[in-house]
Amino acid sequence: VLPAKPENISCIFYYEENFTCTWSPEKEASYTWYKVKRTYSYGYKSDICSTDNSTRGNHASCSFLPPTITNPDNYTIQVEAQNADGIMKSDITYWNLDAIMKIEPPEIFSVKSVLGIKRMLQIKWIRPVLAPHSSTLKYTLRFRTINSAYWMEVNFTKEDIDRDETYNLTELQAFTEYVMTLRCAPAESMFWSGWSQEKVGTTEEEAPYGLDLWRVLKPAMVDGRRPVQLMWKKATGAPVLEKALGYNIWYFPENNTNLTETVNTTNQTHELYLGGKTYWVYVVSYNSLGESPVATLRIPALNEKTFQCIEAMQACLTQDQLVVEWQSSAPEVDTWMVEWFPDVDSEPSSFSWESVSQARNWTIQKDELKPLWCYNISVYPVLRDRVGQPYSTQAYVQEGIPSAGPVTQADSIGVKTVTITWKEIPKSKRNGFIKNYTIFYQAEDGKEFSKTVNSNILQYRLESLTRRTSYSLQVMASTNAGGTNGTKINFKTLSISHHHHHHHHHH
């Protein structure tokens, strides 16, 4: 059988290294060798590249080497496949070397900010040594912030043949580390160089970007003062590297600025003790270059009625996210504050909060929350300076079986009945929402019976037992992940009902 006609011929000119063509099929059924006919020097020269020796036979690639690689030039390439049965020739293909030239990557040697020019980095690099001197090179500069996986790109060309070249990358974030990598190609070429080695540079620092501010209102104390836990953090979009030297807080009762009090702190939280009136609170962060814009918060009066607009809320899990969605009766509300913290028996150690704008959903990556922990999630509507009634729900990002089963006891043992009671599993050991409890009981050498009850039931009366019989019993608590048995208890039904018992003592 004749070899297949070579097709899909593809050639690339590795500048000052080789001119390589590949084709299909890559492998023939029978031993096949190839001859690649080239015309070059604009057609005035021709030669052949062969794959006919044992090491390269059946190999659908061939390279022409210097010094017969001329540039600029137009080549024609024809591939002949030969086996024992004959020869098949490809169509002739035409190659303009400028269009298929691949050069070495450039080398970035510095990425620096320029003194006094904000949000800019100057990239300096060396043109690849192996690149045609006179040709215009096109470049792609890729950059990303150091903690991001998402690359951004900018394209530009450089016509000069200066060995040392620069590009000013503007509109960056202040005081942020950027990773840069650069590739290049002759302007007419379809093949890019590889990417240069990555280099890191940091934009200049500026005054802080701004703060997000929130509060937790605690119940009033006996003396009427209200503890308000203020908390703040760098605003979304602030540079990762931004460091504040400190924070200034000032606050006063509404319409009474002459009662202004000020606090300076280096913490990102502060507890205020306010009266029952409405208060205004202001916080700024500062560094050596200046202050951030002011973050403002209104603390409502103790007796103020807050508006309610969230009608329902759902938490659902996707493959790698927890998504909370809510419905609102107030279309004008487009800002929401989401709080989330673990539902533990003690004071929560980690309290998180985040602002949501122009959406009625909030998403968090599952790996930011602990599996087997129950989280309280509350959403507050925010309309200008007013904060409405929160709507709360609970969620687990991953449920497991409870770490312990219910502690159980048998009460009111009768002749044919018994009342079983059990305690709720502590929050820290539930590992999921308790769906139900199942009571397993079995007479000595008898058949096992079970009864499943809702999770809100902590007591159950078993009937139709056999008199004067020993039973073993345990209660299993179940989550979506499965169940865990509590300790096994034993009891024995009475021979006669309890009120006859004292008259029939056995001596």
Epitope: T39, Y42, K45, S46, T68, T70, E80
Partner: antibody
Framework: EVQLQQYGAELGKPGTSVKLSCKVS????????MHWVNQRPGKGLEWIGR????????IYSEKFKSKATLTADTSSNTAYMQLSQLKSDDTAIYFC????????????WGQGVMVTVSS | DIQMTQSPSSMSVSLGDTVTITCRAS??????VNWFQQKPGKSPRRMIY???NLADGVPSRFSGSRSGSDYSLTISSLESEDVADYHC?????????FGAGTKLELK
């Protein structure tokens, strides 16, 4: 305009040698193969061989391997063919030529030089 | 070496005739065949390259074709300036070889 210039006519005695030149103008001979072709009186064309002036690499027709020696001088943009051990049947017109294999451009031929071998 | 057998060796023709000259290759030379025209005392001139392609400046009455190992040059309506010798050349493989030539003569 590309031109291949071959000069005059050569008269050689049997057993001697002649060296023919082909001066190229309008094109760098490093960028072409230089071919040599002869034509005996009243006969057809015969390919003698070719040289790559870049490296002096030559290929000859078996018949002319011990007859012709091809050289090139890139500094003067000239190709040469030396014919040795001349015999009467070496009498012919000798052409130098640039062939274009791809058809991008034309073929170019010298006007030919008549070599006559006679005692 | 590859032989190029050219026929006829000579041909008497009239103006306006359609003339076909053929070269047969002794082995596969693909498309690598050129046709040349040569007038007395002149250098050859390429008319057809790669078996079927018309060289620059050549009148369209000239055409080249290939059928297997047979290569033909056709002049569709002969004019007086076409009276000349014609040669085929294979350049698929070294050594390159010419056909013996065909001489066109007016009747």
């Amino acid at each position: 305009e590309v031109q291949l210039q071959q000069y005059g006519a050569e008269l050689g005695k049997p057993g001697t040698s002649v060296k023919l030149s082909c001066k190229v103008s309008g094109y760098n001979i490093r960028s072409t193969f230089m071919h040599w072709v002869n034509q005996r009186p009243g006969k057809g064309l015969e390919w003698i061989g070719r040289i790559d002036p870049v490296n002096g690499n030559t290929i000859y027709s078996e018949k002319f391997k011990s007859k012709a020696t091809l050289t090139a001088d890139t500094s003067s943009n000239t190709a040469y063919m030396q014919l040795s051990q001349l015999k009467s049947d070496d009498t012919a017109i000798y052409f130098c030529a640039m062939f274009n294999y791809a058809g991008h451009s034309g073929d170019y031929w010298g006007q030919g030089v008549m070599v006559t071998v006679s005692s | 070496d590859i032989q190029m057998t050219q026929s006829p060796s000579s041909m008497s023709v009239s103006l306006g005739d359609t003339v076909t000259i053929t070269c047969r290759a002794s082995q596969d030379v693909g498309i690598y065949v050129n046709w040349f025209q040569q007038k007395p005392g002149k250098s050859p001139r390429r008319m057809i390259y790669r078996a079927t392609n018309l060289a620059d400046g050549v009148p369209s009455r000239f055409s080249g074709s290939r059928s297997g190992s047979d290569y033909s040059l056709t002049i569709s309506s002969l004019e007086s300036e076409d009276v000349a010798d014609y040669h085929c050349l294979q350049y698929d493989e070294y050594p390159y070889t010419f056909g013996a030539g065909t001489k066109l003569e007016l009747k």
